[in-house]
Interface confidence: low
């Protein structure tokens, strides 16, 4: 990733959005009937159009399944109309591959299926810039319970339900080995308000342990999982179990690299022609690159990873095209 660039201004041939994360869009997209700027300023103060169908632009123009222009004659394409900025909440990844994003806490979650004891699990999450998951609300817990976590054939302890280490510990406060106690957040710095209900205790409890670690048991029958069926277990921290990591959402580039605050990058998603700045774990100040339609090719497919690169699908055409318009940024 490149360092933060100075303030971006729109080039000739681009319309400047008044506000929002998308800064510049191709001029033909102004007043085309499709709001692209987040504040919809590209469709404000437009002359009324009657009796005419406005052309669709960008993503609507190429059917990725067939690699050909839709809507009839390919000559309806204009010089600049292939790449388009996208709405970030729906398209852009805020988590690395394999992590699940929850908007409610701006966090990413991932289950690790290798058998680790609590402390190794905690270290693994820490190395990934996260921690064993704790929950701030019931809704967050329900989100986790509802996820379809990957299920490799040989995962640790996987049957019809799964127990996962999470970031709580149960402290025995009662005397004479009574199991009276309380849940605590395990790791310093967690300020979550949600604490689990009374736990189910491990069957084989070590007489010397005054502290037990939390396992969240998730049931993976689809019919049960969607009813949030789960239970909380207090287990020896040295037993081996799968575990759930949680980390803050982050900017992720198109090659699945995590991007640091303030850096310039192309977001993970389905548009390789966006260039944005990472701010607060989200892409901001985005500019769309301008691509020309590949010449001499009727059927083509966009490269999903490289901007303005196309694969020609014509039987007699050249296989690869680069089509970068001048003054793209």
């Amino acid at each position: 990733t490149e360092p933060l660039r100075p303030e971006l201004r729109c080039n000739p041939g681009q319309f400047a959005c008044r506000s929002g994360t998308i800064q510049c869009i191709p001029l033909p997209w102004q007043c085309d009937g499709w709001a692209t700027c987040e504040d919809e300023s590209d469709e404000a103060n437009c002359p009324e159009v009657t009796g005419e169908v406005r052309p669709h632009h960008g993503k609507e123009a190429v059917d990725p399944r067939q690699g050909r222009a839709r809507g009839g004659d390919p000559s309806h394409f204009h010089a600049v109309n292939v790449a388009q900025p996208v709405r970030f909440s729906s398209f852009l990844g805020k988590c690395p591959t394999g992590w699940h994003h929850y908007e409610g806490t701006a966090s990413c979650y991932r289950v690790y299926l290798s058998g680790e004891n609590y402390w190794d699990a905690a270290q693994t999450c820490q190395r990934l810039n996260g921690s064993l998951a704790t929950f701030s609300t019931d809704q967050e817990l329900r989100f986790v319970l509802a996820q379809e976590w990957d299920q490799p054939e040989r995962s640790f302890g996987w049957k019809d339900q799964r127990k996962l280490w999470v970031g709580y510990q149960y402290v025995i406060t009662g005397r004479n080995r009574s199991l009276e106690g309380r849940w605590e957040v395990a790791f310093k710095g967690s300020s979550e308000v949600f604490l689990p209900p009374d736990p189910i205790f491990a069957s084989a409890m070590s007489e010397n342990d005054n502290v037990f670690c939390a396992q969240l048991q998730c049931f993976h029958f689809p019919t049960l999982r969607h009813h949030d069926l789960h239970s909380w277990h207090a287990e020896s921290c040295y037993e081996k179990s799968s575990f759930l990591c949680k980390r803050s959402q982050t900017c992720v580039d198109i090659k699945d690299n995590v991007v640091d605050e303030g850096f310039y990058f192309t977001p993970k998603g389905d548009d390789p022609c966006l260039s944005c700045t990472c701010h607060g774990g989200e892409p901001e100040m985005c500019v769309a690159a301008l691509c020309e339609r590949p010449q001499g090719c009727q059927q083509y497919r966009k490269d999903p990873k490289e901007c303005c690169k196309f694969m020609c699908l014509d039987p007699d055409g050249n296989s690869l095209f680069d089509s970068m318009a001048s003054g793209m940024r």
């Epitope: 680790e116 004891n117 270290q123 510990q169 402290v171 921290c237 040295y238």
Partner: antibody
Framework: EVQLVQSGGGVVQPGRSLRLSCAAS????????MHWVRQAPGKGLEWVAV????????YYADSVKGRFTISRDNSKNTLYLQMNSLRAEDTAVYYC????????????????WGQGTLVTVSS | SELTQDPAVSVALGRTVRITCQGD??????ASWYQQKPGQAPVLVIY???NRPSGIPDRFSGSSSGNTASLTITGAQAEDEADYYC??????????FGGGTKLTVL
């Protein structure tokens, strides 16, 4: 650089007391559990005691329970071991050690150790 | 001690050596391993399933099977000559160390 600098060892008579100190630097002392581990001359290692990052939880080996007290002063980045009613079998090099995991309840993995201080209990 | 180690093991320079630690508790718990050179404090080399702290060469690895934990040094170096201690929990949940293995590099 993480450093644990120990002091307070020496020769003491059976039944008497001694206090060991361990001054920490190079990490956020108040975020980690701390341990004492000892090693009798020519012998193996023996875990002695642990204290959680905020001092609220303390655990001891059976061999020292009721005689030794572990404590910490986070404002001074210092760990202590108060040893009372010392016995000949307490003769050992005593090490302070930092717990690997940043938690209220320690992992019992010791990722940094002090240089050790010799305690000799002899009449 | 409830964790049993061979008192001494030797290995030729550059060869692979495995140091073992046995105990019933190792069926449930992982061992961790410490290296101690004469007159020095111990150093954590492997903890848990097979985790190396930063600064520990990748020739050190850990594994576990049944009631036995193993520390393997692949391509032993002269500086690996030391005492090696395993530790884990015992059946009552106490933290215990093995008796130690003296490794000689020939």
């Amino acid at each position: 650089e993480v450093q644990l600098v120990q002091s307070g060892g020496g020769v003491v008579q059976p039944g008497r007391s001694l206090r060991l100190s361990c001054a920490a630097s190079g990490f956020t002392f108040s975020s980690y559990g701390m341990h004492w581990v000892r090693q009798a001359p020519g012998k193996g290692l023996e875990w002695v005691a642990v204290i959680s990052y905020d001092g609220s939880n303390k655990y001891y080996a059976d061999s020292v329970k009721g005689r030794f007290t572990i404590s910490r002063d986070n404002s001074k980045n210092t760990l202590y071991l108060q040893m009372n009613s010392l016995r000949a079998e307490d003769t050992a090099v005593y090490y302070c050690a930092k717990d690997l995991t940043r938690s209220g309840y320690p992992s019992y993995y010791f990722d940094y150790w002090g240089q050790g201080t010799l305690v000799t209990v002899s009449s | 001690s409830e964790l049993t180690q061979d008192p001494a093991v030797s290995v030729a320079l550059g060869r692979t050596v495995r140091i073992t630690c046995q105990g019933d508790s190792l069926r449930s718990y992982y061992a961790s391993w410490y290296q101690q050179k004469p007159g020095q404090a111990p150093v954590l080399v492997i903890y848990g399933k097979n985790n190396r702290p930063s600064g520990i060469p990748d020739r050190f690895s850990g594994s576990s099977s049944g009631n036995t934990a193993s520390l393997t040094i692949t391509g032993a170096q002269a500086e690996d000559e030391a005492d090696y201690y395993c530790n884990s929990r015992d059946s009552s949940g106490n933290l215990v160390f093995g008796g130690g293995t003296k490794l000689t590099v020939l």
